[in-house]
């Protein structure tokens, strides 16, 4: 049997026998275009494609629509994988989304959505989520129904303001909503009463800016 040489996601890589976490090359569905992603092969059985990670504020997340579309940062550290790749990938098969969060007091929590996909660019990469479970709040901190994606140069929110400019970062802003994992990074002891921080309201409440976040996806049938 011929060995698979291209992989659409980290689940395929894991199933091929490569079970060490790290950076791998993925291929866009129905294309030869490639993208580098961090694969988490340890959490909850492995096979997770990391689509966002924050940990130290080393990467500026106040980026343009094009940058969020194509991705930025380093898969070994802070990065955004890219809306176009995630949209194409999640449009092909059913994916789950796991969001892992860390606060500054040493606590960890997660939210798991049993179905996640992004619409195409023509629909502003609108997020679709169902089936929330986990420890980071019984209510979804990503507004439901899902919002369009907005950036500093593409305002698609439901606010009289421009949420991306007011809060910083590209996100599925509502008006502006209970979350923004791409907000301004604040260090410990400077992370409360923040209007533009890394927010997940239904876990840590208002104005609390988190220490670390990871968004990762995996096929539902993994």
């Amino acid at each position: 049997k011929e060995e698979q040489t291209t992989f659409r996601d980290c689940a395929e890589i894991f199933k091929s026998g490569l079970t060490t976490s790290g950076i791998y090359t993925l291929t866009f569905p129905n294309s030869t275009e490639e993208i580098k992603a961090y694969c988490d092969m340890d959490v909850g059985g492995g096979g997770w494609t990391v689509i966002q990670h924050r940990e130290d504020g080393s990467v500026d997340f106040q980026r343009t629509w094009k940058e969020y579309k194509e991705g930025f940062g380093s898969p070994l550290g802070e990065y955004w994988l890219g809306n176009e790749f995630v949209s194409q990938l999640t449009g092909q098969h059913r994916y789950v989304l796991k969001i892992q969060l860390k606060d500054w007091e040493g606590n960890e929590a997660h939210s798991l959505y049993d179905h996640f996909y992004l619409a195409g660019e023509e629909s502003n990469y609108r997020i679709h989520l169902t089936g929330l479970t986990g420890t980071a709040g019984k209510i979804s901190s990503i507004s439901q129904p899902g919002s369009d994606f907005s950036t500093k140069d593409s305002d698609n929110d439901k606010c009289i303001c421009k949420c991306s400019q007011m809060l910083s970062g590209g996100w599925w802003f509502d008006a502006c909503g209970p979350s923004n994992l791409n907000g301004q990074y604040y260090p410990q002891k400077q992370n409360t009463n923040k209007f533009n921080g890394i927010k997940w309201y239904y876990w840590k409440g208002s104005g609390y800016s988190l220490k670390a976040t990871t968004m990762m996806i995996r096929p539902a049938d993994f």
Epitope: K158, C159, I160, C161, C163, M166, D174, A175, C176, G177, P178, N193, K194, F195, G197, K199, Y201, S206, G207
Partner: nanobody
Framework: EVQLVESGGGLVQAGGSLRLSCAAS????????IGWFRQAPGKEREGVSC????????YYADSVKGRFTISSDNDKNTVYLQMNSLKPEDTAVYYC??????????????????????WGQGTQVTVSS
Amino acid sequence: EVQLVESGGGLVQAGGSLRLSCAASGFTLDDYAIGWFRQAPGKEREGVSCIRDSDGSTYYADSVKGRFTISSDNDKNTVYLQMNSLKPEDTAVYYCAAVPAGRLRFGEQWYPLYEYDAWGQGTQVTVSS
């Protein structure tokens, strides 16, 4: 650094009055709405009143309409809540909180709780019968 400090709470008899103050620093009231919230033991935090200086708008919960009055002093960067005809059911910890004034949904006048990102530590109000 954004800070909100409440004061003016205390113990008062039913029918009495109190004036709460919320002193804001690190931002100016012109660009923000300030809300007063309260939380009684074992209950959810609830909105009491809100003021938006940019257009002079005020909001009151039905339970306090006609009894409470919200106002602001821009020179002192302070918001006040005058509470008259107090009832035992007004007993709670009272908090003030701030939200950027523009963070409003199209067609709406006021803000969900999760939009208020800066909070004070609270002041206790106890109304005895």
